[in-house]
Interface confidence: medium
């Protein structure tokens, strides 16, 4: 017990008419001691879910349930996720701009389209918002130094293979 | 614990090609996260230079489209930058390191760094 | 192309609040998440603040980040500073497909 306000530490409350510092009830909390009150705790509910729980000390934090996201400062509401051919920004969901894409549910970024003239090659099928530009067969021409653009696993980006 | 590893040559002569590889630890590249590769020159400037998503896909930055390829060996859990016709502006610390595309976009591990420096 | 400015240097007090700023131009501070990382020279950097405000586990709550729409600038703040605060601070922001960084404040701790 302490003889001023001053010295409480976070997680207790204290009046000043009676300066003993004083735990804090279940469900409140305090960051800073010395406080006449303490704040109640945030309880995440509905379309929120805990991320921390709150404590004497530190208030709760939410997060969104699975197919949603958070907007807002300290996650002040939940948004359903972005379709394919849009991307999340702080505004919310938005269309992908001109020359890139997101093929992807959720809260991914929208790609630049592949750039088929770096690998040598033409575009066959023009790209969308939500699909990658299709690059047609390199043009190979076996001098005697060839470069060869290989596809790697599951994804349009290139690799190149020097044919010596 | 995830941990990077950048390893090269520290020192490259002008108009050659700077030849980088990061060796990942605690976590398979083709799981998830895009792979970056960020460079720091002498005065602090960061930039930024490109990745190699999990799926494959590389992006990189508009500055460097023409001299840059970053690619990946997925049976040792590497990736690599190659830089092309390197000046004496390349002389920098190059990093490599994780970052997601999906909410939170951050890098949030990083290699140590290694110094090149292009010098005839 | 967005560009993040950020003062060289800055000094400060132990002890005392420090408020290091870093401003989008070709850009809008509310459309895009920005990100800081505390750098000590030979070592791989760290995040400090992620998506404007949001502080990683074992971070100091210390440090502490916001953003202000009228002078389109994000801010990370240092309460109580402590020696070992000084260190380089980046900002970092992904902006039209590309990832952007500030040029970086030094912090000094007089």
């Known amino acids: 017990v302490q003889n001023s306000c001053d010295n409480c530490q976070p997680g207790t409350f204290c009046r000043k008419y009676n300066p003993v510092c004083k735990s804090c009830p279940p469900s409140t909390f305090s960051s800073i001691g010395g406080q006449p009150n303490c704040n109640i705790c945030r309880v995440c509910a509905g379309y929120f879910r805990f991320k921390k729980f709150c404590s004497s000390t530190h208030n709760a934090e939410c997060e969104c349930i699975e197919g949603f996201h958070c907007l807002g400062p300290q996650c002040t509401r939940c948004e359903k996720d972005c379709r394919p051919g849009q991307e999340l920004t702080k505004q919310g969901c938005k269309t992908c701009s001109l020359g890139t894409f997101n093929d992807q549910n959720g809260t991914g970024v929208c790609r630049p389209w592949t750039n088929c003239s770096l690998d040598g090659r033409s575009v066959l099928k023009t790209g969308t918002t939500e699909k990658d530009v299709v690059c047609g067969p390199p043009v190979v021409s076996f001098s005697p130094s060839t470069t060869i653009s290989v596809t790697p696993e599951g994804g349009p980006g290139g690799h190149s293979l020097q044919v010596l | 614990e995830i941990q990077l590893q950048e390893s090269g040559p520290g020192l490259v002569r002008p108009s050659q090609s700077l030849s980088l590889a990061c060796s990942v630890t605690g976590y398979t590249i083709t799981s998830a996260y895009d792979w970056s590769w960020i460079r720091k020159f002498p005065g602090n400037k960061m930039e930024w230079m490109g990745y190699?998503?999990?799926?494959?896909?590389?992006n990189s930055n508009p500055s460097l489209k023409s001299r840059i390829s970053i690619t990946r060996d997925t049976s040792k859990n590497q990736f690599f930058l190659q830089l092309k016709s390197v000046t004496t502006e390349d002389t920098a610390t190059y990093y490599c390191a994780r970052w997601s595309s999906y909410i939170p976009r951050y890098f949030d591990f990083w290699g140590p760094g290694t110094m090149v420096t292009v010098s005839s | 192309q967005a560009v993040l400015t950020q003062p060289n240097s800055v000094s400060t007090s132990l002890g005392s609040t420090v408020k290091l700023s870093c401003t989008i131009t070709?850009?809008?501070?509310?459309?895009?998440?920005v990100h800081w990382y505390q750098h000590y020279e030979g070592r791989s950097p760290t995040t400090m603040i992620h998506n404007d405000d949001k502080r990683p586990d074992g971070v100091p709550d210390r440090f502490s980040g916001s953003i202000d729409s009228s002078s389109n600038s994000a801010f990370l703040t240092i309460n109580n500073v402590e020696i070992e605060d000084e260190a380089i601070y980046f900002c970092?922001?992904?902006?039209?497909?590309?990832?952007?960084f500030g040029g970086g404040t030094k912090l000094t701790v007089l």
């Open positions: 970092h922001s992904y902006v039209s497909s590309i990832n952007i």
């Open positions: 190699i998503a999990y799926i494959g896909f590389t």
């Open positions: 070709s850009g809008n501070i509310e459309d895009n998440f």
